[in-house]
Amino acid sequence: EPHSLRYNLTVLSWDGSVQSGFLAEVHLDGQPFLRYDRQKCRAKPQGQWAEDVLGNKTWDRETRDLTGNGKDLRMTLAHIKDQKEGLHSLQEIRVCEIHEDNSTRSSQHFYYDGELFLSQNVETEEWTVPQSSRAQTLAMNVRNFLKEDAMKTKTHYHAMHADCLQELRRYLESSVVLRRRVPPMVNVTRSEASEGNITVTCRASSFYPRNITLTWRQDGVSLSHDTQQWGDVLPDGNGTYQTWVATRICQGEEQRFTCYMEHSGNHSTHPVPS
């Protein structure tokens, strides 16, 4: 899994007039990390683990970045021509990633009223637009605005790419939290399914980093993919992750089945409770 930093900004307009303020959230490695507090006009960490990432440093840089990005997005919304009466939103999602081989990716995506209409691979400068005519119109509108001052735009997006990666590297380098290894807690449960069958579920929780192998084995051999159900690996709100895998087995054969877990080079097997 690559390390990633994801910015999600939203600005609003009412009856064609762009509203002051903006909404902003930042995710680090898929975990809620920062949000913009509109009352205090400050970037605020989301939970204790986010505070731990930067230790005792202030969030001034993050506040400045989010404020600047919010201002840019409001200007972009002001140039969208098709704003009818009522409430409209412009959302920008920006993601940068550092992969295991040290390669980087950076992209940004624009949504109008929740509908994707423009994406850019920032490294290559390739823009992509969905097929719908509304998306095409909106994309042309926004791209024309961005092109009005091509040099500023070029500098802005390359700086944005560099800043995102710089921030991500800064968090990764400064933070013991992001280099830690937290082994999962594994819990196996059973429930009656249909006559003669039971469903066994293996849950792994509170682990970090995100990469994990969780699978059911019968007589020591992994079951095929299509006989198991997997849950997504999801953040649990504490800077760690959780997931699950389930399968259906014949009652009385419980002792033949084990849940196999592998995480950060460690592995363990867990029997079905009788």
């Epitope: 390669s103 400068e125 390739e126 091509a150």
Partner: antibody, heavy 115, light 108 residues
Framework: QVQLQESGPGLVKPSETLSLTCTVS?????????WNWIRQPPGKGLEWIGF???????KYNPSLKSRVTISRDTSKNQFSLKLSSVTAADTAVYYC????????WGQGTTVTVSS | EIVLTQSPATLSLSPGERATLSCSAT???????FHWYQQKPGQAPRLLIY???NLASGIPARFSGSGSGTDYTLTISSLEPEDFAVYYC?????????FGQGTKLEIK
């Protein structure tokens, strides 16, 4: 109809600089897209050399970066490739192409590096 | 850089048969930045399929593409004589853009 046409010398001496130009008709190189150079040595596969984008940004293949310069002349709607210190390994068909999924190509020009 | 490996290197089939060509990447690629090309001797390559599954202009419907992440496939449902050529995959997710080494589709 978008068309790309490569031009330049077919024979270059070792250690000299290879220079090629791609003339684009039917589309402005400042409107959109990346404008690429790609080469193919005899009997081998395709190798991306680099591009100049619609905004003027250049990107190069790291394996050639120290020897490559891609530039553009917007008044003539052309972009150019310069590859310095050439050797026999640079003998190839050189193509110019538009885009990121390369949707339009020139017909290619063969460059031989030989004394 | 992302290395693309195509398999098989050569595929020998007869007209009317189904062809399946594979392309595997060393790192995950966004499907919107993955493309296939066809090249015939003495000609420039031509775009066949863009963004994993979209037919380029003028390409017949017997060609199709699929895949995500690191594994992509080009399928020709029923081979026509003019389909025998070399096929290349290409990624545009990261710099440098890279091509697979090619699969030669030849008449059996």
């Amino acid at each position: 109809q978008v068309q790309l046409q490569e031009s330049g010398p077919g024979l270059v001496k070792p250690s000299e600089t290879l220079s090629l130009t791609c003339t684009v008709s039917g589309y402005s190189i400042t409107s959109d897209y990346a404008w690429n150079w790609i080469r193919q040595p005899p009997g081998k596969g395709l190798e991306w050399i680099g591009f100049v984008s619609y905004s003027g940004t250049t990107k190069y293949n790291p394996s050639l970066k120290s020897r490559v310069t891609i530039s553009r002349d917007t008044s003539k709607n052309q972009f150019s490739l310069k590859l310095s210190s050439v050797t026999a390994a640079d003998t190839a068909v050189y193509y110019c192409a538009r885009g990121y999924g390369f949707d339009y190509w020139g017909q290619g020009t063969t460059v031989t590096v030989s004394s | 850089e992302i290395v693309l490996t195509q398999s098989p290197a050569t595929l020998s089939l007869s007209p009317g048969e189904r062809a399946t060509l594979s392309c595997s990447a060393t790192s995950s690629i966004s499907s919107i930045y993955f493309h296939w090309y066809q090249q015939k001797p003495g000609q420039a390559p031509r775009l066949l399929i863009y963004r994993t599954s979209n037919l380029a202009s003028g390409i017949p419907a017997r060609f199709s593409g699929s895949g995500s992440g690191t594994d992509y496939t080009l399928t020709i449902s029923s081979l026509e004589p003019e389909d025998f050529a070399v096929y290349y995959c290409q990624q545009g997710t990261t710099i440098p853009f890279t091509f697979g080494q090619g699969t030669k589709l030849e008449i059996k």
